[in-house]
Interface confidence: medium
């Protein structure tokens, strides 16, 4: 271009529709100058004005020759220009904001402009820059960029922001700019210029003074508390933890925390002192729920449902901001909400849900929230799987028969369409317990009954009844226990029965043993003792309980004695006993020894002995009859231990074994014995029944048995010389060579001479007899042998 | 998605110990009761034992009384089956599966060999 | 121990044919009974539980039905994927032999 020619052509668009155009004229050109725009190879491409701009549909690809022709009073100048698309900056129109909104509560701030997208012939990108500023100072909080579509038409766009720090604590204002990314056009493209401002502040009303007001924040976050105030602000605390100050505006101040510790359920005191005041909110520091532990589902009654479960780690918030549980129910739809007011137990927490009428399998989802977030856990439960029986109730024992029982009891519940197994739990006093499982039909009316045999008459029991369902989910608590007396049967045997004559030999006295209580079946009342030979039967009057022994005035004929129990109900089958017993002349006394306790008898198995055993016993030293206690025992026995508490060590006992056939005895065997020997207690007295100048002639006599206490083995008898009266005296006395000892086994022995002794010699004799339980103690006699003549 | 998956099969030797695990992912893991079931080789399915949602319960097949023993760590999601003394009738797929009696979700198994 | 006999042990049959199994409980365990179908190299999958309650997302053509010891499984019309190998297994108890299967029945092409 020529000097005094226009210069400088450049163009722009706002929408790629219109190229706008300018130049600078050329110097030394006034107002009144024309110009003619030519545009090659487009028809009617030439334009006159009087400006020094144009503005021109947008070109298609390629370079495009421009003519200007300045026309003015000195003459005219042409300028030639080449126009590419290349050369065009794409510049978007200032950008306005239609609305700017705030949310207090959530310190959030709503933008709303319009993108003018209609004026734009392709779909573009368009970026925006959004830039917030915060105090009358304008400080620079944040710039966003924010994406968007043009397409085609006008779009409102809404865009928004949550502060970090309450609006209300100072004037906050937004500025956005856009710059379009078209992919169709290939010139500069520059950023639009910032839309007018625009700003929002709150009016403060006379109370509130500390913002944000009663906050539910998550534990860890940042927060900023601030305080508008009239006067200075002196200190803030958080807790009792000191907060530096950033002042905002006038005398407005703020403080910022950064990873808020849990709260205490009452929250977090935040405090702003002024000299005058102090202002102050409250912050709520915690979680959102935990995903529900270890939800379960059963039913106790297949009426309603009960879920349980967990709420995991605390969230720290309480009253209106803990956690609220929702229970949905998938396939019906239905829904039940925990209410805050049924606490926890033992930190699980629970909810009822009504069962629908035929539906079995159910798709629980529980939905927990609280206003930091919310949390589910689904179970899907077959429910007819998952029953709790409640505790039985009503539980009643009623009497079948002496043997047998009917349980009754109450279970809630509609369970026509399952099974229960009941568990019984049967305690004999003093017994081991038996438990036993029975399987019943489940009814709609709750009341169940069953019959329990097999059972001991005239027994105090205890039951008690659990049941789960025949599936088993859960056993039900135990009923109560209830305790029960078995009604009276005929007792099942008859006494243990046993007969001695007396001394005189005329009367025979009949003992018997009372009833274990297994086979009494009752209360024993009475007794019947009758006697029969082959001619006659004679009764004795009625004996009643506890006398356990008659007398019969009887001759030496045989003859059956009978042994009848009876109580409430009936008698029990006789007892049979001959009077007379079956001789046996091959007899000998043995000795027997026990073991402490007992006493172990054993002899040879008997054929012939088709009843039983009998054992008698009784102290050797009492007078006639013998019988201190018998047992029996079966025929096929061939050993039996005697135990009895009146067993006494160094008592000697006659035991004696009969055999039993026909209801006759027979004595097997005769025996004396000990249940422990112990030494004697007494020494034999000796006495000198002749001296001589060189021997003495000792006899003495037996020590009775009481005294012995133990069957004797044999005599100890010790001499040498010795003196009465001196220190030389004892004989027993030990390291004595001179002392000679002689032993006596022969028990028969009572006399012993002493022989080679000196003349007119004193001697020191000492006699003392011993068991197997041990050595008595000593008599001793001093004696003088005669002068050697 | 919701599935279980097992691990920790291998080839031991009679006499010794191995420890199966199972993790559960797409459900609430602790509100379910789970099973082990094991298949021997070309044989049928074979149940070994079971635990309840809460490990309150747990019950075992006879042939493995008093040497298996099932467990659970439910802040884990994770199923575990401790085997002592193995025999080579142990030897099977071992498959985790849910529910305390119809079993209605299964993992693909592991692979348990006890071999001299 | 509550033992599972399920018949028969293999079945051949065509598409498009009604297949039935049968099992047998050794004492009644009224409905407590589950069906399950196992592919080679997979898993079992549950089909049928209490007796005759149909899994959600099973097919309808698999049914079930019986109570106390006798029990059938049936598919209508039977389909190329249904070749496979079917088990019983009764959950009414876990004391004293816990849950058992029955001894499956591998129902193949014919």
């Known amino acids: 271009q020529k000097k005094g020619a226009p210069h400088d052509l450049k163009c722009v668009t706002n929408n790629l529709q219109v190229w706008d155009c300018y130049w600078k004229a050329p110097s030394g050109t006034g107002r009144g100058t024309d110009y003619e725009v030519c545009i090659e190879n487009r028809s009617h491409s030439c334009y006159q004005l009087e400006k020094t701009n144009i503005k021109i549909p947008a070109l298609s690809h390629g370079d495009y020759e421009i003519t200007i022709n300045s026309l003015h009073d000195f003459g005219s100048s042409t300028s030639k220009f080449t126009l590419n698309e290349q050369n065009v900056s794409l510049i978007p129109d200032t950008p306005e904001i239609l609305n700017l909104s705030a949310d207090f509560s959530t310190s959030t701030l709503y933008l709303k402009w319009n993108d003018r997208g209609s004026v734009f012939p392709h779909h573009s990108n368009v970026i925006w820059e959004i830039k917030i500023l915060r105090k009358e100072s304008m400080e620079l909080v944040k710039l966003v960029t924010h994406n968007t579509t043009l397409n085609g038409k006008d779009t409102l766009h809404h865009w928004s922001w949550a502060s970090d720090m309450p609006l209300e604590c100072a004037i906050h204002f937004v500025e956005i700019r856009c710059y379009i990314d078209s992919l169709h056009f290939s010139g500069r493209k520059e950023w639009s210029d910032w839309s007018p401002v625009k700003n929002i502040s709150w009016m403060p009303d006379s109370q509130t003074k500390v913002f944000p007001q009663d906050k539910v924040i998550l534990v860890g976050s940042d927060i900023t508390f601030c305080c508008i105030s009239q006067e200075k602000v002196l200190s803030a605390l958080i807790g009792h933890t000191n907060c530096p100050l950033i002042h905002l505006d006038g005398e407005n101040v703020a403080i910022k925390i950064h990873n808020i510790s849990v709260s205490a359920s009452s929250g977090t005191n935040v405090v702003f002192t002024t000299e005058d005041n102090i202002f102050g909110t409250v912050i709520f520091a915690g979680y959102p729920p935990d995903t529900p532990q270890q939800l379960n589902c059963e039913t106790h009654d297949l009426k309603e449902i009960l879920c349980r479960w967990n709420p995991g780690r605390a969230t720290a918030l309480v009253g209106p901001r803990a956690t609220s549980y929702t229970l949905l129910e998938s396939f019906s739809g239905k829904y039940v909400r925990f209410k805050r007011a049924e606490a926890p137990t033992n930190g699980s927490y629970q909810l009822f849900f009504q069962m629908l009428p035929n539906q079995e399998i159910y798709n629980f989802t529980l939905n927990a929230h609280n206003p930091l977030g919310r949390s589910e856990s689904t179970i899907l439960v077959n429910i007819t799987e998952k029953v709790y029986p409640h505790t039985p109730t009503s539980f009643k024992v009623k009497d079948i028969n002496s043997t047998a029982v009917k349980l009754s009891w109450h279970l809630p519940g509609n369970f026509a369409k399952i099974n229960f197994l009941c568990q019984i739990e049967i305690k004999k006093s003093n017994t081991v317990q038996e438990q036993r499982n029975v399987t019943i039909k489940g009814v709609e009316n709750s009341s169940y009954l069953v019959a329990l045999d097999k059972l001991n008459p005239y027994t105090v029991y205890t039951f008690r009844i659990r049941c789960s369902t025949e599936t088993f989910w859960k056993w039900s608590k135990w009923s109560n226990k209830k305790q029960h007396l078995t009604t009276e049967a005929i007792p099942s045997k008859g006494p243990d029965t046993w007969r001695e004559w007396s001394s005189d030999g005329k009367n025979l006295i009949i003992y018997w043993k009372p009833l274990p209580i297994n086979e009494a079946n009752g209360k024993i009342l009475s007794y019947n003792v009758s006697c029969s030979s082959d001619e006659e039967t004679q009764s004795l009057s009625e004996i009643p309980d506890p006398q356990h022994k008659a007398e019969i005035q009887l001759d030496k004929n045989d003859y059956i004695i009978s042994v009848v129990a009876k109580n409430s109900v009936g008698s029990s089958p006789p007892s049979k006993i001959a009077s007379m017993e079956i001789p046996n002349d091959d007899l000998k006394i043995e000795q027997v020894v026990g073991m402490g306790k007992g006493i172990l008898l054993t002899w040879h198995y008997d054929p012939n002995m088709t009843c039983d055993y009998v054992i008698k016993w009784c102290n050797s030293s009492r007078s006639e009859p013998c019988l201190m206690d018998w047992r029996k025992v079966p025929s096929n026995s061939t050993e039996t231990v005697i135990e009895s508490d009146q067993f006494r060590p160094g008592v000697r006992y006659n035991f004696f074994l009969y055999g039993c056939r026909n209801q006759g005895y027979q004595l097997l065997r005769s025996m004396i014995g000990y249940i422990e020997e112990l030494a004697p207690t007494v020494a034999p007295n000796f006495t000198v029944e002749d001296t001589s100048a060189d021997s003495i002639l000792v006899k003495w006599e037996d020590i009775p048995v009481e005294e012995l206490r133990g069957f004797l083995r044999g005599y100890l008898f010790y001499f040498g010389k010795g003196e009465r009266d001196t220190s030389k005296m004892r004989v027993l006395e030990s390291g004595r060579s001179d002392i000679k000892v002689k032993n006596i086994t022969d028990i028969s022995q009572k006399t012993l001479r002493i022989a080679d002794l000196q003349g007119k010699t004193s001697y020191h004799l000492v006699l003392r007899a011993y068991t197997d339980g041990g050595v008595g103690p000593e008599k001793s006699m001093y004696v003088v042998t005669k002068e050697n003549s | 998605q919701v599935q279980l998956v097992e691990s920790g099969g291998g080839v031991v030797q009679p006499g010794r110990s191995l420890r199966l695990s199972c993790v559960a992912s797409?459900?609430?893991?602790?509100?379910?009761?789970m099973n082990w079931v094991r298949q021997a080789p070309g044989k049928g399915l074979d149940w070994v034992t079971v635990?309840?949602?809460?490990?309150?319960?747990?019950y075992y097949a006879d042939s493995v009384k008093g040497r298996f023993t099932i467990s659970r760590d439910n802040s884990k999601n994770t199923l575990y089956l401790q085997m002592n003394s193995l025999r080579a009738e142990d030897t099977a797929m071992y498959y985790c599966?849910?529910?305390?009696?119809?079993?209605?979700?299964w993992g693909q198994g592991t692979l348990v060999t006890v071999s001299s | 121990d509550i033992q599972m006999t399920q018949s028969p042990s293999t079945l051949s049959a065509s598409v498009g044919d009604r297949v039935t199994i049968t099992c047998r409980a050794s004492q009644s365990i009224s409905s407590w009974l589950a069906w399950y179908q196992q592919k080679p190299g997979k898993a079992p999958k549950l089909l049928i539980y209490k007796a005759s309650s149909l899994e959600s997302g099973v097919p309808s053509r698999f049914s079930g039905s019986g109570s106390g010891t006798e029990f059938s499984f049936t598919i209508s019309s039977l389909q190329p994927d249904d070749f496979a190998t079917y088990y019983c297994q009764q959950y009414k108890s876990f004391s004293p032999g816990g849950l058992t299967f029955g001894g499956g029945t591998k129902v193949e092409i014919k």
């Open positions: 599966a849910r529910g305390e009696r119809t079993l209605d979700l």
């Open positions: 797409g459900f609430t893991f602790s509100s379910y009761g």
């Open positions: 635990i309840w949602f809460d490990g309150s319960n747990k």
